[in-house]
Amino acid sequence: HKCDITLQEIIKTLNSLTEQKTLCTELTVTDIFAASKNTTEKETFCRAATVLRQFYSHHEKDTRCLGATAQQFHRHKQLIRFLKRLDRNLWGLAGLNSCPVKEANQSTLENFLERLKTIMREKYSKCSS
């Protein structure tokens, strides 16, 4: 069956996000992937969206992330826009109103996005074959 257009949009956004480092991609987020054995796919997407929302809500106006040059400022603003887009699309795929995020483990945002990209690419390869 055909892949959801939202899934393609998520992969495109993740590709853009993982191409660029910013001052704040090394900051840590909750690692929901560390122990996701008994988690449904929809719950994983919902929890990933929750983590991203927590990150951009907290760091959108963080002066350390905005940097000291126009280029750093621009890259951070772009990062936030892409995270918001990813959050929206993940909620769309999840179809859940809310989900708990209680893990203690942390990973950098950069690693979190790479892991999410791997999961999404695997999902895409299954639905496109």
Epitope: L66, G67, H74, K77, Q78
Partner: antibody, heavy 116, light 108 residues
Framework: QVQLVQSGAEVKKPGSSVKVSCKAS????????ISWVRQAPGQGFEWMGG????????NYEERFQDRVTITADNSTSTAYMELTSLRSEDTAVYFC?????????WGQGTLVTVSS | AIQLTQSPSSLSASVGDRVTITCRAS??????LAWYQQKPGKAPKLLIY???SLESGVPSRFSGSGSGTDFTLTISSLQPEDFATYYC??????????FGGGTKVEIK
């Protein structure tokens, strides 16, 4: 609601200077840039320069570098654009805009007429 | 400096028509492109950013596509309020911004 309110129209003599203000409401100054763009009568847009108040950086379009100064007063959330050595070709509507690469909110525009 | 060339410079169309405006960059700009609508005597209004993201509150009949050097703004079904001038703008060379020359959409 974000609003950018610019100062009123100006008529200036060639060789003089003009200073246009742009007062921002909302949280514009805390995490956005303010860019200045002008539009000559019946023409397209020219980006003149911009300022990022929260980090204090200012950048100018090369052709305006010698004549334009962009400043910001964080305490009043107001940005300023001063253009010196005015000539008739500077007659245009000058816009400020909240910017992060693209301009999502614009001021109403300030008409500057340069005439002897 | 990156130059943006819009085509056509003007077009005539009827209400209900599908309208396509193109913007070509002199070098690759990834997806760092925005589209604006301007009506006479008014400030421009942002329609699309990041080449394809619809600005909040903008009707879904507007869409943007493209990446690299070639970009398109499409109005799927032209409405009376859509007669205006449309501009593209690149921000890949941030902080330097450049605009296209504009496309005037007139009533046929």
């Amino acid at each position: 609601q974000v609003q950018l309110v610019q100062s009123g129209a100006e008529v200036k003599k060639p060789g003089s200077s003009v200073k246009v203000s742009c007062k921002a409401s909302g949280d514009t100054f805390s995490s956005y840039a303010i860019s200045w763009v002008r539009q000559a009568p019946g023409q397209g847009f020219e980006w003149m320069g911009g300022i990022i108040p929260v980090i204090g950086t200012v950048n100018y379009e090369e052709r305006f570098q010698d004549r334009v100064t962009i400043t910001a007063d964080n305490s009043t959330s107001t940005a300023y654009m001063e253009l010196t050595s005015l000539r008739s070709e500077d007659t245009a509507v000058y816009f400020c805009g909240r910017e992060e690469g693209f301009l999502d909110y614009w001021g109403q525009g300030t008409l500057v007429t340069v005439s002897s | 400096a990156i130059q943006l060339t819009q085509s056509p410079s003007s077009l005539s169309a009827s209400v209900g028509d599908r309208v396509t405006i193109t913007c070509r960059a002199s070098q690759g700009i990834s997806s760092a492109l925005a589209w604006y609508q301007q009506k006479p005597g008014k400030a421009p209004k942002l329609l699309i950013y990041d080449a394809s993201s619809l600005e909040s509150g903008v009707p879904s009949r507007f869409s943007g596509s493209g990446s690299g050097t070639d970009f398109t703004l499409t109005i799927s079904s032209l409405q009376p309020e859509d007669f205006a001038t449309y501009y593209c703008q690149q921000f890949n060379s941030y902080p330097l911004l450049t605009f296209g020359g504009g496309t005037k959409v007139e009533i046929k």
